[in-house]
Interface confidence: medium
């Protein structure tokens, strides 16, 4: 025998109190798949969270963070205060990147500068707290008669907090 509840589409639930009729999810709740016996309560984006996508009968609300804060964790489970570029957030607050590291965003951690010599290249532009080192041609390419110049290596993306 087929379960009558399997006919209930997303956005409804199989109401045992009403002879297993498919009833629409009540306000502020949703079901994202068919055959559900209950609807889930919508997430509320409160406090430091702000609504990025409204809840519908078939999908949960999605939150991001109010100005001055950014998301951390899967599905923006937390918000933390922004730091400046060239800093990272520690337990003591925002701290400048140590020498040899950089962060070009208001979030995330300081990452080491690209080590140009590991790739046999010269440093074209020195790294700063806010930006990665840019590698130039290898010293061998700079010998007289050499004409080709290796394009700078793309700056490595600093670690992102998941959105």
């Amino acid at each position: 025998l087929q379960d009558p509840c399997s006919n209930c589409p997303a956005g409804t639930f199989c109401d045992n109190n009403r002879n297993q009729i498919c009833s629409p999810c009540p306000p502020n709740s949703f079901s994202s798949a068919g055959g559900q016996r209950t609807c889930d309560i919508c997430r509320q984006c409160k406090g430091v969270f702000r609504t990025r996508k409204e809840c519908s009968s078939t999908s949960n609300a999605e939150c991001d963070c109010t100005p001055g804060f950014h998301c951390l964790g899967a599905g923006c489970s937390m918000c933390e205060q922004d730091c400046k570029q060239g800093q990272e957030l520690t337990k003591q607050g925002c701290k400048d990147c140590r020498f040899g590291t950089f962060n070009d965003q208001k979030r995330g951690i300081c990452q080491p500068w690209t080590n140009c010599s590991l790739d046999g290249k010269s440093v074209l532009v020195n790294g700063t707290k806010e930006s990665d080192a840019v590698c130039g041609p290898s010293p061998a390419d700079l010998s007289p008669g050499a004409s080709s110049v290796t394009p700078p290596a793309p700056a490595r993306e600093p670690g992102h907090s998941p959105q």
């Epitope: 406090g47 702000r50 001055g68 804060f69 400046k84 607050g93 208001k106």
Partner: antibody
Framework: QVQLQESGPGLVQPTQSLSITCTVS????????VHWVRQSPGKGLEWLGV???????DYNAAFISRLSISKDNSKSQVFFKMNSLQADDTAIYYC????????????WGQGTSVTVSS | DIVMTQSQKFMSTSVGDRVSVTCKAS??????VAWYQQKPGQSPKALIY???YRDSGVPDRFTGSGSGTDFTLTISNVQSEDLAEYLC?????????FGAGTKLELK
Amino acid sequence: QVQLQESGPGLVQPTQSLSITCTVSGFSLISYGVHWVRQSPGKGLEWLGVIWSGGSTDYNAAFISRLSISKDNSKSQVFFKMNSLQADDTAIYYCARNPLTATVMDYWGQGTSVTVSS
Amino acid sequence: DIVMTQSQKFMSTSVGDRVSVTCKASQNVGTNVAWYQQKPGQSPKALIYSASYRDSGVPDRFTGSGSGTDFTLTISNVQSEDLAEYLCQQYNSYPLTFGAGTKLELK
């Protein structure tokens, strides 16, 4: 307890700059942001800008060209500077703390009255 | 910029009454609205954030509600110390903006 205290010049000549210091106690600037808001009879409350715990700043676009906010964590002081003042900048200027729960102001200073006049 | 409209500049009430102050946002701000109380010659005092969360130490006769564009601050059993101006603020996006305020007066 949490306190914020603004200190400013009172009277500023037109075209001159305004500097206000906000001295805080009962909390650390390493952990909390500080907003600047002004209030005038004609325009009500206007948000001017904020300096966050890490020192990053966000300004109201209407004031960004002539506004600067900085701070000294060790002295528990936040510095506000606005250039090229005109008569309509006459207002009470407040500093206020941002809590860790939302982009709002949970504690306010008593405000400093600034008149722009020659 | 998001405009916060408090259409009533003044509201008359009596001690013990229940009164509702309204605020309308020019666009959807979710629940990212705060309410402040300001008495003459004083700085604003935080009452409510996130449309409905009372700040610490705020009496429970103050209740916030609403989402999207329409918000209400309700004061039940008004006390004489509640006679003040009430201002709403949105913090959904920069620049942060305030309503013009509603003054609560005695009938």
